[in-house]
Interface confidence: low
């Protein structure tokens, strides 16, 4: 067991051009806080995977109001360290996500409004008990400077916090076969208290008689690799060909512990040691709380923190789901106007506009008729992206230079015959139909079925997004 500690030194504009605007203003004073999420291993885990090593939220920093006209300085930071306790061994390699959040302190009666300013991530190797490691990470125009370390909580020591130390029983030396515990030379390495046979490489214990497995290992003595496909052979003795230890029949056979729990045999049955966020006989009950950092992708956890999962994740733009685990296809909302192409860049939406349009959502219609000419009496029409001509009767094409056949589009409905005419076209309707395009049936009693007025459209309820 131990604690991962993170000290934020500064958060402010990074070097180079394009300094970011201050996130706070006189109209909207704000303060910063930070969230750290830790995951074991160096693998490129999906952003939505849980903070399996733990997560922590800092205190709020001092209230900050931008000085008008001044560039954004390093912003005032919260006091103290962010501490992420870890119950099991320190893995040595880990991934981190550090998020900088802004809490706006306007006159919202409902309390503060939060928004994610920056997120940095990385993968590092770190031995517990070592010195502070310094780091600089950039997110867009922002720069975050911080230090971190992992330290063991007594009586644990060592680079993985798996060795146990106890105060010396005698002032001068440790007991037989026991070494002093560097760097605590006044303490001795504790006698072996783990279950007999517990793997020294893959197992550890915090209490006598225990054998708890490091990630990737299972079995009562932590000697069985998890999910080793070559080991999934029928039950039998240790296989020399696969190099796998195939356990004989026992209560932990097949690992009855769900959700990554590790199984230990007991005299009468088995016992599951559950990972954070789960409990129950087989670790089948989710007891995730805000303390477990259940909100992914920078979601902010609020609400109760009881074992019934009484928390709510407020998701940043672009994510949804009860844990903000799903990326929203924001382009499905068709935010780009006038035929613009939508690009979801994750941190923002971009619209690639067609010629003749501009603006964040291609909403601005440029003057595409400037310097354009339409032949044969055609008039140039704004709003089509590229220049568009509305042609006089009898002409067509991009610039109205082509003589048009008005009957080419078969405009006469219900089998009517089309005749080109100097004023446009004329439809000669088949029996039983009438109208300029033969669109209306003539009833036997002579009344025509003209279309009813279109029904009133009831707009859908507006969607709300957190």
């Amino acid at each position: 067991a131990g604690v991962f500690e993170l000290q934020i030194h500064s958060f402010g504009p990074g070097p180079g051009p394009g300094a970011p605007r201050s996130p706070c203003s006189a109209r909207l004073p704000c303060r910063l806080f930070f969230r750290v999420c830790l995951k074991p291993g160096l693998s490129e885990e999906a952003a939505e995977s849980p903070c399996a090593l733990g997560a922590a939220l800092s205190a709020r920093g001092p209230v900050y109001t931008e000085q008008p006209g001044a560039p954004a300085p390093d912003l005032p930071l919260p006091d103290g360290l962010l501490q992420v306790p870890f119950r099991d061994a320190w893995p040595g390699t880990f991934s981190f996500i550090i998020e900088t959040w802004r809490e706006e302190l306007g006159d919202q009666i409902g309390g503060p409004a939060w928004s994610l300013l920056a997120r940095v991530a990385g993968r590092r190797r770190l031995a517990a008990g070592g010195p502070w490691a310094r780091d600089i990470q950039r997110a867009g125009a922002w720069e975050l400077r911080f230090s971190y370390r992992a330290r063991c909580e007594p009586p644990a020591v060592g680079t993985a916090c798996t060795r146990l130390c106890r105060p010396r029983s005698a002032p001068s030396r440790c007991g037989p076969g026991l070494r002093p515990c560097a760097p605590l030379e006044d303490e001795c390495e504790a006698p072996l208290v783990c279950r007999a046979g517990c793997s020294p490489e893959h197992g550890f214990c915090e209490q006598p008689g225990e054998c708890r497995c490091l990630e990737g290992w299972t079995g009562p003595l932590c000697t069985v690799p998890v999910s080793t496909s070559s080991c999934l052979s029928p039950r039998g003795p240790s296989s020399a060909t696969t190099g796998c230890l195939v356990p004989g029949p026992g209560p932990c056979d097949g690992n009855p512990c769900a959700n990554g729990g590790s199984c230990s045999e007991t005299p009468r049955s088995f016992e599951c040691t559950c990972p954070r966020g789960f409990y129950g006989l087989r670790c089948e009950v989710s007891g995730v709380t805000c303390a477990d950092g259940p909100c992914f992708n920078g979601g902010l956890c609020v609400g109760g923190a009881d074992p019934d999962s009484a928390y709510i994740c407020h998701c940043p733009p672009g994510f949804q789901g009860s844990n903000c685990e799903k990326r929203v296809d924001r382009c499905s909302l068709q935010p780009c106007r006038n035929g613009g192409l939508c690009l979801d860049l994750g941190h923002a939406l971009r619209c690639r506009c067609r010629a003749g349009f501009a603006g964040p959502r291609c909403e601005h219609d440029l003057d595409d008729c400037a310097g354009r000419a339409c032949a044969n009496g055609g008039t140039c029409v704004e709003g089509g992206g590229a220049h568009r001509c509305s042609c006089a009767l009898g002409f067509g094409g991009r610039d109205c230079r082509e003589r048009a056949d008005p009957c080419a589009a078969r405009p006469c409905a219900h089998g009517g015959r089309c005749y080109a005419h100097f004023s446009g076209l004329v439809c000669a309707c088949a029996p039983g139909y009438m109208g300029a395009r033969c669109e209306f049936p003539v009833h036997p009693d002579g009344a025509s079925a003209l279309p009813a007025a279109p029904p009133g459209l009831r707009p859908g309820d507006p969607q709300r997004y957190l």
């Epitope: 009666i109 409902g110 309390g111 303390a291 609400g303 928390y311 709510i312």
Partner: antibody, heavy 116, light 107 residues
């Protein structure tokens, strides 16, 4: 301006049910949670439960079998129903708008007396 | 359920004095703690949230500190209107539980 107003029956006979309505204004029930809390005369506060903006509810485990919290977002109303009342359920009942997991803005309360 | 033990249950003090009220949680609750003030015949009003943050419109003579299991609430210079009741509430784990309350009285 955020406001919460509780309206209840005032007097309830023992073993009967209690229904209280909390009518809110100045915010949307789809965006914020609402808690119910009670306070017996001259005593401390007891949290009864919460309904979140998304509709999920959480109850005080000691009272869960007797409690129901529902809401009508369109009418801006939250409802507390409590069964099998006894005299020790006599209390001031408050609804409160949750500020996430940080605390709450309370209504004025409604006094419920359980008596024959 | 998490028990919140608030002390003292009542305290006498004079105008201008400082007083401190303590709340102990039966298990660690991080900083998920709020402090409320309740005047006679009125509903409680939020003073402090997240253990240390002052709610909107609350005078700066009120302050909160602590994390984990031990929390303190301090009024630095008592005014006449401060002699009322105060409650802590944990919001870490439902059921969100309150302390028993502290009644401040004028000496």
């Amino acid at each position: 301006q955020v406001q919460l107003k509780e309206s209840g029956p005032g007097l309830v006979a023992p073993s009967q049910s209690l229904s209280i309505t909390c009518t809110v204004s100045g915010f949307s029930l789809t965006d914020y949670g609402v808690s119910w809390i009670r306070q017996p005369p001259g005593k401390g506060l007891e949290w009864l439960g919460v309904v979140w903006g998304g509709g999920s509810t959480y109850y005080n485990s000691a009272l869960k079998s007797r409690l129901s919290i529902t809401k009508d977002n369109s009418k801006s109303q939250v409802f507390l129903k409590m069964n099998s009342l006894q005299t020790d359920d006599t209390a001031m009942y408050y609804c409160a708008k949750q500020r996430g997991q940080y605390g709450a803005y309370w209504g004025q309360g409604t006094l419920v007396t359980v008596s024959a | 359920d998490i028990q919140m033990t608030q002390s003292p249950a009542s305290q006498s003090a004079s105008l201008g004095e400082s007083v401190t009220i303590t709340c102990l949680a039966s298990q660690t609750i991080g900083t998920w703690l709020a402090w409320y003030q309740q005047k006679p015949g009125k509903s409680p009003q939020l003073l402090i949230y997240a253990a240390t943050s002052l709610a909107d419109g609350v005078p700066s003579r009120f302050s909160g500190s602590g994390s984990g299991t031990k929390f303190s609430f301090k009024i630095s210079s008592l005014q006449a209107e401060d002699f009322v009741s105060y409650y802590c509430q944990q919001l870490y784990s439902t059921p969100w539980t309150f302390g028993g309350g502290t009644k401040l009285e004028i000496k």
